[in-house]
């Protein structure tokens, strides 16, 4: 209308996609009767009648809004349900009396995008690329209007930087009218970026205000050349023979270069390549003293064929040689003395100990063991242990058997054996002495003899129990060059009163074995030996 004041700015109504927009007609009573109103949508400056109000009753016009409009608030408000991005336009209400006036409403539509989906370059980024490479992409789906993207590295926003950082964003419109934003971060990375955390942030607006969504943080595979190569040995600390030792070649490049490990040969002064496993690790299992020496690693860049050499590393596999004892097979008369000497070599200072084999009792700390006034109980095993105190588990031992000359010594003097007539009896008899004795039986039967050790013998006799045998008993006789000795086994018939409920009938009836701990001879003690058990 000519001379009319300029139209005021439309009222702003903000609403989220899918919800209901309430369009309140702001005409005052002086501007028009709200019981007689026409509603229009304005799109690209074209008005389209969408709703009529007559006498307070509403009627939708055919078209895109037909099913989604209704009157509220006694006809003053038009409700638009299921708002879509296409509804972002101006709506106006026009009163019919007394004068034709209109009221304009700008509908703004919002939709939060989905969580941003960040993808990292699956092939990684070389630091020597000539141009910025695609580092990662960020996709924000189904937002409205188009969200803004900000890229972050280690918590700091990334800015466009000529030839260094370039952010390339594009958007597509889905059939729903929502936007999907794709942003590509292109950058020239440096070695220090190997641990950098990248993420993207979508900034968007809702009726409630400004909001943002962050992607997960990602690291980018960064490739950079090797500058330094070094060797690592596991386990750390002192190594000993028998250990599993791994010599590993390491480099500060990514991807790791091709490695070879070589060991210096002291005689030829040349390095000899060692055979490594697929990971370039040299495994020494078990480690031996011959593995000691100077190792170094060579790393090859297969693209450039440039090689780097590590600092050499000295490897010392500590050892203890075979232990030698002299005399190696000592023989002594009762009452005499003996000096045992132990020797060994090692890469470290050695400690020696002498132990009694049967009891593990420590007899001497040092390489020399002196024994005086030897008794026959002194016969048996003596162990020399050569160990490196600074390396637990590094030791070698040597056992020496001392033989004391003497006539046979029986494990028991006499013993009662319970038997049944006509049963086959298994009898055993044990004797010791030096020289080693032989055992004979005074009855016929099947006898077998076995060495327990160089000075001790065990004879077993299988015999049928007869009345004569019950009467005479059985004798076993042990003899050597220095004398003889006898043990007697008395046979007793089993009757009901003999057997007690806890008797082991099998043992009681069929066998007679003597253990070396049930001795029946005179005993004596000597210096540096444990007190003997009570015997006989």
């Amino acid at each position: 209308v000519p001379g009319e004041a300029e139209q005021p700015a439309p009222e702003l109504v903000e609403v989220e996609v899918g919800s209901t927009a309430l369009l309140k007609c702001g005409l005052s009573q002086s501007q028009g009767n709200l019981s007689h109103v026409d509603w229009f949508s304005v799109h690209k400056e074209k008005r389209t009648l969408i709703f009529r109000v007559r006498q307070g009753q509403g009627q939708s016009e055919p078209g895109e809004y037909e099913q989604r409009l209704s009157l509220q608030d006694r006809g003053a408000t038009l409700a638009l349900t299921q708002v879509t991005p296409q509804d972002e336009r101006i709506f106006l209400c026009q009163g019919k009396r007394p004068r034709s006036q209109e009221y304009r409403i700008q509908l703004r539509v919002y939709k939060a995008p989905e969580e941003p989906n960040i993808q990292v370059n699956p092939l990684g980024i070389p630091v020597n690329s000539k141009e910025p490479e695609e580092v990662a992409t960020c996709v924000g789906r189904n937002g409205y209007p188009i969200p803004q993207v900000i890229w972050y590295k280690n918590g700091r926003p990334l800015k466009e930087e000529k030839n260094r950082v370039h952010i390339q964003s594009s958007q597509t419109v889905e059939s729903s009218g929502l936007y999907t934003l794709q942003s590509i971060l292109k950058a020239q990375l440096v070695k220090e970026d190997k641990d950098a955390q990248f993420y993207c942030e979508l900034n968007y607006r809702l009726p409630s205000g400004n909001h943002m969504k962050e992607s997960r943080e990602v690291t980018v595979p960064v490739f950079y050349p090797t500058e330094k190569v070094w060797l690592e040995v596991e386990p750390v600390g002192m190594l000993k023979e028998g250990d599993r030792v791994e010599i590993r070649c390491l480099a500060d490049g990514n991807p790791p270069p091709h490695f070879s490990i070589s060991k210096g040969n002291p005689s030829t002064r040349e390095a000899e390549e060692e055979t490594t496993n697929d990971n370039g690790v040299l495994v020494l299992e078990p480690a031996r003293k011959e593995h000691s020496g100077r190792y170094e690693c060579q790393a090859w860049n297969l693209d450039t064929m440039i090689s780097l050499l590590s600092e050499p590393q000295e490897l010392l596999v500590n050892y203890v040689s075979d232990v030698r004892v002299s005399p190696a097979a000592p023989e002594r008369q009762e009452g005499s003395s003996l000096t045992l000497t132990c020797e060994a070599e090692s890469s470290q200072d050695l400690e020696f100990q002498w132990l009694r084999e049967e009891t593990d009792q420590v007899l001497e700390r040092g390489p020399v063991l002196q024994l005086h006034d030897l008794k026959r109980e002194a016969g048996g095993g003596y162990r020399c242990v050569a160990s490196v105190p600074s390396i637990p588990g590094l030791n070698r031992t040597q056992l020496v058997k001392l033989a004391i000359f003497g006539p046979p010594w029986m494990a028991f003097k006499e013993r009662k054996v319970w038997v049944k007539e006509n049963m086959v009896l298994n009898l055993s008899c044990e004797a010791s002495g030096h020289p080693r004795p032989t055992i004979s039986w005074n009855v016929n039967g099947t006898a077998s003899e076995g060495d327990q050790d160089p000075q001790r013998v065990l004879s077993t006799l299988n015999v049928l129990v007869t009345p004569e045998l019950l009467e005479t008993g059985v004798e076993c006789t042990a003899s050597n060059d220095l004398g003889k000795n006898t043990s007697i086994l008395f046979l007793e018939l089993v009757n009901l009163t003999t057997l007690t409920p806890d008797s082991n009938t099998t043992t009681g009836l069929s066998t007679s074995t003597a253990s070396p701990h049930t001795r029946a001879n005179s005993t004596s003690t000597e210096r540096k030996l444990p007190e003997p058990e009570s015997r006989g």
């Epitope: 993808q119 699956p122 092939l123």
Partner: antibody, heavy 116, light 106 residues
Framework: QVTLKESGPVLVKPTETLTLTCTVS????????VSWVRQPPGKALEWIAA???????YYNSAFKSRLTISRDTSKSQVVLTMTNMDPVDTATYYC??????????WGQGTLVTVSS | DIQMTQSPSSLSASVGDRVTINCKGS??????LAWFQQKPGKVPKLLIY???SLQTGIPSRFSGSGSGTDFTLTISSLQPEDVATYYC????????FGGGTKVEIK
């Protein structure tokens, strides 16, 4: 529109070197990476190598020592060479465009037979 | 290397059936997964990227879902022209393809 076309020999002898060319149109090699993928008869797809929009090269470690990928941006061509060919390398070889990390367009493929 | 395992290796279904193909990664690949269709004697064709985004021009009966290690391609109503081998491919670390699933019509 975007197209990729592979060319090269259909038959190579064992121990020989294979050279394949991928000629592209509808996009620039300085904007998109290109990969080579192969498929032995009746078998699954296998990625071989790629060259990025910035010119960086990447190889499948299973073939790395035998492969070279390069490009000529002025001719819109990507070239793959594979040395020491073996009958097990008989396959259809495809080139494919990255967008930016997945493959959105593929060439029609070229069947390479390795036989003496 | 990341391995991708597809199941089943083949299936037969009737026209109009709902068909699902599974793909399992040997480690978490988030949503870095694409699905391809390869008809006999033809070139692989991109159907789905980023695990669930439908490539432009692909019918809406194709959909993708999943994230992490377990993914699914669904054909809501199988059509005769869908007879093909379908491959999943991860692009989280390098590129590896599944062994393929051959889809046939009963």
């Amino acid at each position: 529109q975007v197209t990729l076309k592979e060319s090269g020999p259909v038959l190579v002898k064992p121990t020989e070197t294979l050279t394949l060319t991928c000629t592209v149109s509808g996009f620039s090699l300085t904007s998109n990476a290109v990969s080579w993928v192969r498929q032995p008869p009746g078998k699954a797809l296998e990625w071989i190598a790629a060259i990025s929009s910035g010119g960086s090269t990447y190889y499948n470690s299973a073939f790395k020592s035998r492969l070279t990928i390069s490009r000529d941006t002025s001719k819109s061509q990507v070239v793959l060479t594979m040395t020491n060919m073996d009958p097990v390398d008989t396959a259809t070889y495809y080139c494919a465009r990255h967008r930016p990390f997945y493959f959105d367009y593929w060439g029609q493929g070229t069947l390479v037979t390795v036989s003496s | 290397d990341i391995q991708m395992t597809q199941s089943p290796s083949s299936l037969s279904a009737s026209v109009g059936d709902r068909v699902t193909i599974n793909c399992k990664g040997s480690q978490n690949i988030y949503k870095s997964l694409a699905w391809f269709q390869q008809k006999p004697g033809k070139v692989p064709k991109l159907l789905i990227y980023d695990a669930n985004s439908l490539q432009t021009g692909i019918p809406s009966r194709f959909s993708g879902s999943g994230s992490g290690t377990d993914f699914t391609l669904t054909i809501s109503s199988l059509q005769p022209e869908d007879v093909a081998t379908y491959y999943c491919q991860q692009y989280y670390s390098g590129y590896t393809f599944g062994g393929g699933t051959k889809v046939e019509i009963k």
